[in-house]
Interface confidence: low
């Protein structure tokens, strides 16, 4: 059993209340985290509660405001960025969201030395991306798909690229599919460590088919949104990487970095770029059939001002049992010799672990090992490597931070976080200052989140940065549900689950069960984190039992589980949810006539297939923004797990795994189908096709669309959505309103 915030005494029980839906929709019980904005080994910036930008020096204990809330407010700034030479700050306003990571904004440059905004040669608007060089105060920015450079904020810009065109050529920013499925960033440009060079990607979407959907707005005629979006098997973007010398950008102009021959021989992706030194860069490439990745280390040839990527510096990573990497191929963390690096990939037993590569991948030295997985390398210093894993006490849904001493032999390992606040904190991330002099630990649960500052040498806690006292006080009179994380062993498969139980849970009674599912490849739902959300309310107020199950295809438990779904999406994920439900029924406290399942996105796909499994287990279910056929989803994501929808590859399973193929099986369940009409990610087309198939099969169902809403169904739609789903479930479970 996971302990929640301390309970008040029974005498005060009558003052306790259940969670309400309003609590959830208002965000009454949301928590805060504190991530320092590090600017040196011992200094960080933080935006105070009253919106001043404050610089903290850990060693002197001093703090001072570098930018007042008055200055911030004068341009309605919602974000800021200090130049590394500390002479200027950019202020970001007029934030306008585009896709998951991308947005445009207006930028103002404030000169800290004279306390005035820089006038003359102001930046154009709106800008798609802007960043300082890592040293000094050069600016690189993307405007109308072209990259510009300023040596100083007040200087006229130097235009680096000229061919940028909306929806055609993207320079320094990703197109839709690279943003969502490969880079997971809004930018595609990278400064070298001292700002000498600027590397950038150019994406050519000229030949990509376009998804078009109506945006209704308020006008007489709807607008049409057009996005180059490669669905499975379609033509993909063509990517090229260029590097330009920013000291004298016009001298040779941008130089293209060559693609490794074994990659360039067929369709490929660029997956990431890591600068090693100012004159050494590491690029990662991936074949379109994503089981071969090549890491290529390139050196600047000053004689011809070109980038040389010798075959001897190509490192191949190949998977024979699935796709390369986890969700993404991991990125290298280079050591101080600027050629060897640390990287996470599968070991011979099929667990993702840290390896040290000095010359070849074949000769890699394994740094961590065991039937658990290394998840992230945070920092490598000259004597330590900091990483996170789920090793401790064999709970895959935990994250602890470890330090390996690489300066000594044999290397020694220490868990930095395992015993700090053991009951409260089992899921950590970390943020390190320069040279790991200090670091912040951010604990996400299972108790109330807490952020702390630590000495990078001794690991000693220096101070609490954020402990969510107000939240703790607010929760004192709330009857929170109980949570437990356990596992089921079924046919040599371990199914970890999280069960959320009503506050007065009694094993001898029967409760309605709601399965919340995501289930996508390399995801994890069963995590030791704190949350007060919709399902907390359903357990607290409506007396439901909610369960989350990590089945085959999910992450951090080895390749056997992860790659089980390779080329077979929609089979084992569904089977494992059903298996778990049967096991829950055997536990004796589930009312088997009142079982529901719901999910969003991939979870909507799984919940739909589970409802249409013909098992008779589910009374009802909800699919929010589901995928309905893998032929409708993005190439980069889909083909990673499914291969190509061609006769000689995997077309048959593409066809067999659709929701539409199972339309008849929805006849005996109550189905609520929900989708936003402006979903750029999982297109409304998916739900439109489900609805059409159900109508053609003369199957009754319920549906809700959200006009002009995207995949996140945000704003007022969120309130409407959860209210609507609550009514649906309460009706399904015969719970009074």
């Amino acid at each position: 059993i996971v302990l929640r915030p301390s309970r008040v005494h029974n005498s005060e029980e009558n003052t306790m209340r259940a969670l309400t839906l309003k609590d959830i929709l208002n965000g009454t019980f949301s928590y805060k985290t504190f991530f320092p904005n590090w600017i040196s080994g011992q200094e960080y910036l933080h935006q105070s509660a009253d919106n001043n930008i404050v610089l903290y020096n850990i060693e002197t204990g001093q703090s001072y405001t570098i930018l007042s809330n008055r200055t911030m407010k004068s341009v309605n700034a919602s974000n800021y960025g200090l130049s590394p030479d500390r002479q200027f700050v950019y202020l970001e306003s007029d934030y306008s969201k585009l896709w998951r990571y991308s947005y445009t904004a207006t930028y103002y440059i404030y000169d800290l030395s004279n306390g005035e905004f820089v006038r003359g040669n102001e930046l154009p608007r709106p800008i798609q991306y802007l960043c300082w060089s890592p040293v000094g105060s050069k600016l690189a920015y993307v405007y109308q798909n072209n990259i510009y450079l300023k040596q100083r904020p007040g200087d006229p810009p130097f235009q680096i690229t000229f061919n940028g065109r909306e929806n055609k050529i993207f320079n320094g920013i990703p197109d839709w599919v690279y943003e969502e499925e490969m880079l997971a960033t809004k930018y595609a440009l990278w400064w070298s460590p001292n700002g000498k060079f600027l590397a950038y990607a150019e994406f050519n979407d000229t030949d990509i088919p376009v998804i078009a959907y109506s945006y209704y707005g308020d006008e007489q005629y709807p607008r049409t949104i057009n996005i180059p979006y490669p669905k499975a098997g379609a033509k993909n973007p063509v990517v090229r990487i260029f590097i330009i010398d920013t000291t004298y950008p016009a001298y040779v102009g941008p130089q293209e970095v060559p693609v490794p021959a074994m990659i360039a021989s067929s369709d490929y992706y660029f997956s990431w770029l890591t600068w090693v030194t100012d004159e050494r860069v590491c690029l990662q490439w991936l074949k379109r059939v994503q089981n071969v990745s090549v890491l290529s280390i390139c050196d600047f040839r000053e004689d011809w001002q070109t980038w040389d990527c010798p075959k001897t510096q190509e490192h191949i990573e190949e998977s024979r049992t699935g796709w390369a990497g986890g969700f993404f191929v991991s990125t290298p963390v280079f050591s101080y010799d600027a050629i060897s690096y640390y990287k996470i990939f599968s070991d011979k037993d099929g667990y993702k672990h840290i390896h040290y590569i000095k010359d070849t991948v074949e000769n890699a030295i394994q740094i961590t090992s065991g039937k658990w997985e290394a998840i992230n390398i945070f920092r490598v210093t000259q004597d330590s490597l900091f990483y996170s894993s789920n090793e401790f006490e064999e709970y895959p849904g935990r994250r602890n931070i470890y330090r390996i001493s690489i300066g000594s032999y044999p290397p020694s390992k220490k868990c930095v976080t395992c015993h700090l606040r053991k009951e409260r904190c089992q899921y950590y991330t970390a943020s390190f200052s320069d040279y790991a002099k200090y670091y912040a630990l951010v604990c996400y649960g299972p108790g109330i989140p807490i952020s702390t500052l630590h000495d990078g040498r001794t690991d000693q806690e220096i101070k609490i940065l954020e402990e969510n006292k107000e939240l703790e006080n607010a929760l004192k009179n709330i009857q929170l549900p109980k949570e437990e994380i356990k596992k089921l062993e079924v046919d040599e498969i371990t199914l970890w689950y999280k069960m959320i139980l009503p506050p007065q849970f009694d094993r001898s009674k029967k409760y309605p069960l709601l399965i919340q599912v995501y289930g996508g490849p390399c995801s994890q739902s069963v995590r030791s984190v704190f949350a007060v959300n919709w399902i907390s309310y359903l357990a607290s107020k409506e007396g439901m039992v909610i369960a989350l199950v990590d089945g085959r295809g999910t992450a951090f438990q080895g390749d056997k589980l992860l790659y089980a779904v390779y080329r077979k999406l929609g089979v084992y994920e569904v089977e494992d949810q059903i298996t778990a439900v049967r096991k829950f029924i055997e536990m004796g406290f589930i009312d088997e006539k009142r079982i529901a399942i719901w999910g969003w996105s991939y979870g909507g796909y799984v919940s739909s297939l589970a409802l249409a499994s013909g098992t008779g287990l589910f009374k009802c279910g909800i699919a929010v923004a589901p995928v309905s056929s893998w032929e409708y989803y993005a190439s980069v994501y889909t083909e990673r797990f499914m291969g190509l929808p061609t006769k000689d590859d995997n077309l048959e399973h593409y066809k067999n795994s659709t929701v539409m193929a199972r339309a008849e099986y929805f006849r005996n369940v109550d189905y609520l189908l929900i989708h936003g009409t402006a979903d750029d990610n999982v297109h409304f087309q998916n739900s439109a096709q489900i609805a059409k198939a159900l109508v053609n099969a003369q199957v009754d169902f319920q549906a809700m669309w959200y006009s002009d809403q995207n995949h996140g169904l945000s704003g007022l739609s969120t309130n409407h959505l959860y209210t609507h789903m609550t009514h649906f479930l309460k009706q399904c479970f015969s719970l009074s309103d």
Epitope: F162, N163, D245, P254, W304
Partner: antibody, heavy 116, light 112 residues
Framework: QVQLVQSGAEVKKPGSSVKVSCKAS????????ISWVRQAPGQGLEWMGG????????TYAQKFQGRVTITADKSTSTAYMELSSLRSEDTAVYYC?????????WGQGTTVTVSS | DIVMTQSPLSLPVTPGEPASISCRSS???????????LDWYLQKPGQSPQLLIY???NRASGVPDRFSGSGSGTDFTLKISRVEAEDVGVYYC?????????FGQGTKVEIK
């Protein structure tokens, strides 16, 4: 401000060699190409070759291959051009130039006269 | 080697009037990155050459805006919108699309 200062005028006999120096001051020397360009009396500019001091590998125009050697000494920020087997048609002003994007820097020129 | 051909070789001009010099290369100077690797230089009498235009069309630092460069691939033009007396000298185009750079023969601009 970057300045390239070249060595003084030379008078050489046919068949001999000449070595012209070019010292950079007031800016970064190493990462940028130092080119050597010559101009015979009343004639146009002729690119002879170049070197990036950081790398030390020189490139030469085909016409001068085997006769010209371009070197650089990073420690003194000096580039050198040595031309051997001199003939009368090598009489010219020899310039060193540093490429640098939107501006360039040239030496004042060194007059080499080849005469018997 | 890439051969650069300039025309005319001599250009008498009237102050205040426009002037134009052409430069043709034996191979395309358009790089795959979209830049044309062609520069224009002016050598005034008794001086070292000075850079006027780089990458086909970009004015070098401190160059008056009466100078402009255009063209792509193999054909390039340098234009002076209104010639001034100080513009006299020899104008050279230079390619740097490959490792071995080459100059044009030069165009001598003099006042009529």
């Amino acid at each position: 401000q970057v300045q390239l200062v070249q060595s003084g005028a030379e008078v050489k006999k046919p068949g001999s060699s000449v070595k012209v120096s070019c010292k950079a001051s007031g800016g970064t020397f190493s990462p940028y190409t130092i080119s050597w360009v010559r101009q015979a009396p009343g004639q146009g500019l002729e690119w002879m070759g170049g070197i990036v001091p950081n790398v030390g590998v020189a490139t030469y125009a085909q016409k001068f291959q085997g006769r010209v050697t371009i070197t650089a000494d990073k420690s003194t920020s000096t580039a050198y051009m040595e031309l051997s087997s001199l003939r009368s048609e090598d009489t010219a002003v020899y310039y060193c130039a540093r490429d640098a994007a939107d501006r360039d820097y040239w030496g004042q020129g060194t007059t080499v006269t080849v005469s018997s | 080697d890439i051969v650069m051909t300039q025309s005319p070789l001599s250009l008498p001009v009237t102050p205040g009037e426009p002037a134009s010099i052409s430069c043709r290369s034996s191979q395309s100077l358009l790089h795959s990155n979209g830049y044309n690797y062609l520069d224009w230089y002016l050598q005034k009498p008794g001086q070292s050459p000075q850079l006027l235009i780089y990458l086909g069309s970009n004015r070098a630092s401190g160059v008056p805006d009466r100078f402009s460069g255009s063209g792509s691939g193999t054909d390039f033009t340098l234009k002076i919108s209104r010639v001034e007396a100080e513009d006299v000298g020899v104008y050279y185009c230079q390619q740097r699309n490959n490792k071995n750079r080459t100059f044009g023969q030069g165009t001598k601009v003099e006042i009529k």
